[in-house]
């Protein structure tokens, strides 16, 4: 008799990443009978919510429901109706909401309550919204990329199933750049993690991992730019800020009230004799780089070595996956290739930043001007952060892999978060039972 395929027995999960600049919804799918296997969960959909991050709704919470509608309705379409009630939904908010909570716990709670109210009214198994810690964000990003790269699998393979795979069980470090924070997470080589706050211990699939992680709040690309502007306007002689991080000919008016709205600029706040100032781009990579370096305090370190601002950082070890804005920015600049050396990246940035704004606008006519105008800063910031902040060198640069997706799933903290909350990463290696799950009868 002919073998007949059984109906697909799958499960789904939804995670919303409520970032500082926007919210994204991810739908994951996996075979129900293989929940504890490594590498079986994959992303089937990403939906980017139109609009800003949820922290921007603090004065208009009644608009949150409409804001989330399109992506939640998309989830209803993608996931079969019969699975809706069993599909868990999680929302994790990151540094944008951490900053709002620093300003006002009450306002942050109001936003989260209204977000929860909106998400509770869909026919899924909503599990709540919360602000995840920077440590969690780093840890879940590290879990995600290593899960997708097959690093937790105990089976050694003679062939490579994913890009970047070095065919050993050495885990990749994770470098995550958001709008409001940045995370660095990796397993140091035989190095004591000198600060307990930066140490994580995991037992995954029967193996112990001692992981270093740190999240630098206010050092995401958007907040870093606000910091830089607040620092530089302090020494401006008038309401004109000649800024090397913007293209020559670029002009933009900034409200001082907007500049000082974020807790990230508090350390630079001063009474200015004007309410607005104008950024005038001069497009000079070297000067931009120098200005950015002033955001990193490297004069103080209470440990054997530090990243910046007195934060312990062990010696870098192994390969790193750089994702989120690290990837988006470098992809736009066409600098994600493994073959591009750090020196070449710096040269390309020098040329890019020096290009006149009118020329840039013509070359990238399809890109929103707000984003387009900031790529010179963002690219320079990435180089500064990786080289001076985290102490990558021209030699170790080749160990950084700019990653958007792995096996069709976005690199980022959301998959690791869901794997953890659904208990899909066992502490011990599951017993191999190859004959217990037959696909055909």
């Amino acid at each position: 008799t002919q073998n007949k395929a059984l109906p697909e027995n799958v499960k789904y999960g939804i995670v919303l990443d409520a970032g500082s600049s926007h919210t994204s919804l991810y739908i994951y799918k996996w075979p129900a009978e293989k929940e504890n296997d490594t590498g079986v969960v994959h992303q089937v959909e990403e939906c980017r919510v139109k609009g800003p991050g949820i922290s921007k709704f603090v004065q208009k919470v009644n608009e949150i429901g409409i804001y989330l509608t399109d992506c939640m309705e998309r989830a209803r379409e993608v996931i079969p109706r019969s699975q809706h009630q069993e599909t868990p939904v999680y929302l994790g908010a990151t540094a944008g909401m951490r900053l709002l909570r620093m300003e006002s716990e009450e306002l942050a709670d109001r936003v989260l309550d209204v977000v929860e109210r909106s998400l509770s009214n869909y026919p899924f198994d909503f599990q709540g919204a919360r602000i995840i810690t920077g440590q969690e964000e780093g840890a879940y990003g590290w879990i995600t990329i290593n899960y997708l790269l097959g690093k937790f699998s105990q089976k050694t393979r003679w062939f490579s199933i994913v890009p970047y795979e070095t065919n050993n069980q050495e885990t990749f470090g994770a470098l995550d750049l958001g709008g409001a924070s940045t995370q660095v997470t990796f397993v140091p080589q035989n190095q004591t993690i000198e600060s307990p706050d930066n140490a994580l211990q995991f037992r995954l699939y029967g193996k112990d991992y001692n992981v270093y992680t740190h999240s630098f709040l206010c050092y995401g690309k958007d907040q870093a730019l606000w910091q830089k502007l607040a620092k530089d306007i302090q020494v401006a002689s008038n309401e004109i800020l000649r800024d090397p991080c913007f293209h020559p000919g670029y002009k933009k008016v900034v409200n001082v009230s907007d500049l000082y709205k974020t807790p990230c600029t508090k350390r630079f706040e001063m009474t200015l004799p004007f309410q607005q100032f104008e950024i005038q781009g001069i497009g000079n990579y070297q000067q931009c780089h120098q200005s950015i370096l002033e955001l990193f305090n490297t004069s103080y370190c209470p440990y054997s070595q530090c990243a910046f601002n007195g934060i312990f950082l062990p010696p870098l070890q192994g390969d790193f996956g750089a994702f989120s804005a690290f990837y988006f920015v470098m992809k736009f600049l066409n600098l994600t290739s493994e073959k591009v050396s750090q020196e070449k990246v710096t040269e390309m940035m020098k040329k890019f930043c020096a290009q006149p704004w009118e020329e840039i606008k013509t070359s990238y006519a399809g890109v929103k001007e707000k984003y387009l105008s900031e790529y010179c800063f963002s690219g320079t910031y990435i180089l500064s952060l990786l080289l001076q902040g985290y102490h990558f060198t021209a030699d170790s640069w080749e160990h950084i892999h700019f990653i958007g997706k792995i096996q069709g799933s976005d690199a980022g903290w959301t998959l690791g978060y869901m794997l953890n909350l659904t208990n899909m990463i066992p502490a011990e290696q599951p017993l191999s039972t190859p004959l217990s799950h037959s696909t055909y009868v």
């Epitope: 709670d109 109001r110 989260l112 309550d113 209204v114 929860e116 109210r117 998400l119 509770s120 009214n121 869909y122 026919p123 909503f126 599990q127 709540g128």
Partner: antibody, heavy 119, light 107 residues
Amino acid sequence: EVQLVESGGALVQPGRSLRLSCAVSGFTLSNYGVHWVRQAPGKGLEWVAVILRRGSTDYNAAFMSRFTISKDNSKNTVYLQMNSLRADDTAVYYCAKTAVVAGDYFDYWGQGTTVTVSS
Amino acid sequence: DIVMTQSQKFMSTSVGDRVSITCKASQNVGTNVAWYQQKPGQSPKLLIYSASYRYSGVPDRFTGSGSGTDFTLTISNMQSEDLADYFCQQYNSYPLTFGGGTKLEIK
């Protein structure tokens, strides 16, 4: 087992105040929202107010100036403070738990407490 | 405010009947509608949410349908224990509003 028990209902004169309590068990107020819904004699249901798990509140505009919802997580109790009561506030008042974390439909209701406003 | 209208205040039924109770919203509420059953002297019980999703433990003879402005609660095989008031509720926007109720009676 999830339970909500209302208390505090009474016969009061117009213009007076009353505080209703809703003692909950089987779930925690830090994990779920609680609503107050009322039902006038022989009438349908009317939504009054909600308090969500972090303490945010919303009201039916018809009651906003006179009624206040609050909670004490440590006592597992939600309150409805009702001021300037009128004859048309006469009803059975129910507290109800959100079916999902903070949803606007209700999977468990209390047995109700009767408020009669009359001179 | 969104008005939820249950045009039939009373419906006469017999055991075994297929009964359909309707509810109309004054404006589009998507599928943000719940149905409750209330027996005399008791508090309401949730039957259906999101217009068509049966709440756990509710017998499968109860089904909900509709979207936008028109909604129906159907009891496919009326039982004597189903004699009660039935209310629809919209939760698409605040204030939450209920229909006036439909009372099922025996013929």
